[in-house]
C-alpha cells in the first residue's frame, strides 16, 4: 500500500469565535499532506485545503452560509508527493471531526465599549456592535443581526476611587445607569447568551473609564 | 427539573378578562424567554406572543396586540398572560412554552382551558 | 408573516414502517424549523430544531431535514407509543408560526 508512512489526523477540534472558524487536528506531518472536507448532516462533502502541510483549515466561508447547520469535517491524510495513493480499503486515511452547531457553540468575543456619555446623574454605555461574517443579501451581519434577543450585555461599573462593582444589563447594545454626580466611574462589558449551556459568556472589555484622555465622547 | 406550572381552568363570559399564570422552576427564570400558544378545540397551535422575563418587555403576535398582555412577577418566577374582550372563539387551552436558544420551545406548561361562552 | 403547509392532514401506517411528514414554508426560512409531537390531552413536545437537530431524549428514529422552504421530518420505524399529532413550526422570523398538523395513526 502506498500509505505506509501516512498516519491518520487526529485531535480535529473546531476554533471558533464569533463565526470566524477554524478546524484544528494533529499531527502536524511528516511526509504526508492533508486535505479538509466539510459538510452538513444532509449535504454533499466539499473540499477545503487541498493537500496542505497545515494543521488547520479556515471553514468560515462554509459555516457562514447557515449558521444554524450542524457541519462535520474530516481530514484526509496523504503521503506527500503521492496524493493519488490510497489505503488498502482503496480510500484515502481520514477522521471525523466531531459536530459542530455554529449558533449554539461559536464562542462570543471580546466586546467593545464605543462610547459614554454623561448627562446629569446619568450615563449612557454603548457597546460596539461588532460585525461577523455571517452575510445576508451581501451584507455583513452584526453579531446583534445575528443572535437577536438571544444576545444580551451585562455591564461592570464602578467608582473610580472604590472597587464595589454594580451591574446592569440590556438586550439592546446600549445601557443608561445612574451615577453620583462628581464621581468617575468604570465600565467594562460581558456579551452572554444565557440560554445557551456552552460557551455562554465572553471575556470582559477592556476597562474604559472617565475623565481618562479618550474622553466621554468616543467614535 | 425544569417545569412551568400553570393556573386551572377558566369560564369565562364574553366581553370579559382572562389572566392565566404560569410558574416556572428548575431553572434560571431571567435568561429564558416566555412564550404563549393556545390551541382551540380540535385545531392547531397558535402564538400569541412572548416576554422577557428579565426587563418585562414582550412582543405580541400582531392578531392579539389590541387584546393580549403578558407581564412577570421575577420574586416568584411567575409570568401571566392577561386576554380581553373575550369571545367564543377565544375558547382554547393556553400554553406558556420555554424559548430555547435560537428559537424552539421546549419546555411548555400543562395548559389552561379557557372557555367563553354566554 | 409566514405560512406554513403541512402535508399530508392525517395519515395511518403500520408498526414498523417509515413514515414522512413534509412541511413548506412560504418564504426562505433557513434552517429555522422545529417539530413537534402532541398526544392527545397533552402538552406539545420538541423533537427537532434547527431542521435536523435532536432535541435532548428524543429518540433516534425521529430525524428531520430541509433547507429553505421545504422541509420532511422522517419516522424509520413507526412505534405504538408514536400516535400523536405532530407539528412544524418556523423560528426564522416573528411571529412564529406552525403548521396545520399531521395525525398519524397505527392501522
Known amino acids: 500500500s502506498g500509505t505506509t508512512n501516512t498516519v491518520a489526523a487526529y485531535n480535529l477540534t473546531w476554533k471558533s469565535t464569533n463565526f470566524k472558524t477554524i478546524l484544528e487536528w494533529e499531527p502536524k506531518p511528516v511526509n504526508q499532506v492533508y486535505t479538509v472536507q466539510i459538510s452538513t448532516k444532509s449535504g454533499d462533502w466539499k473540499s477545503k485545503c487541498f493537500y496542505t502541510t497545515d494543521t488547520e483549515c479556515d471553514l468560515t466561508d462554509e459555516i457562514v452560509k447557515d449558521v444554524k447547520q450542524t457541519y462535520l469535517a474530516r481530514v484526509f491524510s496523504y503521503p506527500a508527493g503521492n496524493v493519488e495513493s490510497t489505503g488498502s480499503a482503496g480510500e484515502p486515511l481520514y477522521e471525523n471531526s466531531p459536530e459542530f452547531t455554529p449558533y449554539l457553540e461559536t464562542n462570543l468575543g471580546q466586546p467593545t465599549i464605543q462610547s459614554f456619555e454623561q448627562v446629569g446623574t446619568k450615563v449612557n454605555v454603548t457597546v460596539e456592535d461588532e460585525r461577523t461574517l455571517v452575510r445576508r443579501n451581501n451584507t455583513f451581519l452584526s453579531l446583534r443581526d445575528v443572535f437577536g434577543k438571544d444576545l444580551i450585555y451585562t455591564l461592570y461599573y464602578w467608582k473610580s476611587s472604590s472597587s464595589g462593582k454594580k451591574t446592569a444589563k440590556t438586550n439592546t447594545n446600549e445601557f443608561l445607569i445612574d451615577v453620583d454626580k462628581g464621581e468617575n466611574y468604570c465600565f467594562s462589558v460581558q456579551a452572554v447568551i444565557p440560554s445557551r449551556t456552552v460557551n455562554r459568556k465572553s471575556t470582559d472589555s477592556p476597562v474604559e473609564c472617565m475623565g481618562q484622555e479618550k474622553g466621554e465622547f468616543r467614535e | 427539573e425544569v417545569q412551568l406550572v400553570q393556573s386551572g381552568a377558566e369560564v369565562k363570559k364574553p366581553g370579559a378578562s382572562v389572566k392565566v399564570s404560569c410558574k416556572a422552576s428548575?431553572?434560571?427564570?431571567?435568561?429564558?424567554?416566555m412564550n404563549w400558544v393556545r390551541q382551540a378545540p380540535g385545531q392547531g397551535l397558535e402564538w400569541m406572543g412572548e416576554i422577557n422575563p428579565s426587563t418585562g418587555g414582550s412582543t405580541y403576535n400582531q392578531k392579539f396586540k389590541a387584546r393580549v398582555t403578558m407581564t412577570v412577577d421575577q420574586s416568584t418566577s411567575t409570568v401571566y398572560m392577561e386576554l380581553s374582550s373575550l369571545r367564543s372563539e377565544d375558547t382554547a387551552v393556553y400554553y406558556c412554552?420555554?424559548?430555547?436558544?435560537?428559537?424552539?420551545?421546549?419546555?411548555w406548561g400543562q395548559g389552561t382551558t379557557v372557555t367563553v361562552s354566554s | 408573516s409566514i405560512q406554513m403547509t403541512q402535508s399530508p392532514s392525517s395519515l395511518s401506517a403500520s408498526v414498523g414502517d417509515r413514515v414522512t411528514i413534509t412541511c413548506k414554508a412560504s418564504?426562505?426560512?433557513?434552517?429555522?424549523i422545529a417539530w413537534y409531537q402532541q398526544k392527545p390531552g397533552k402538552s406539545p413536545k420538541l423533537l427537532i430544531y434547527f431542521a435536523s437537530n435532536r432535541y435532548t431524549g428524543v429518540p433516534s428514529r425521529f430525524s428531520g431535514s430541509g433547507y429553505g422552504t421545504d422541509f420532511t421530518f422522517t419516522i424509520s420505524s413507526l412505534q405504538p407509543e408514536d400516535i400523536a399529532t405532530y407539528y412544524c413550526?418556523?423560528?426564522?422570523?416573528?411571529?412564529?408560526?406552525f403548521g396545520g398538523g399531521t395525525k398519524v395513526e397505527i392501522k
Open positions: 412554552a420555554r424559548r430555547e436558544l435560537g428559537g424552539p420551545f421546549g419546555y
Open positions: 413550526q418556523q423560528d426564522y422570523s416573528s411571529p412564529w408560526t
Open positions: 428548575g431553572y434560571s427564570f431571567t435568561g429564558y424567554y
Open positions: 418564504q426562505s426560512v433557513s434552517s429555522g
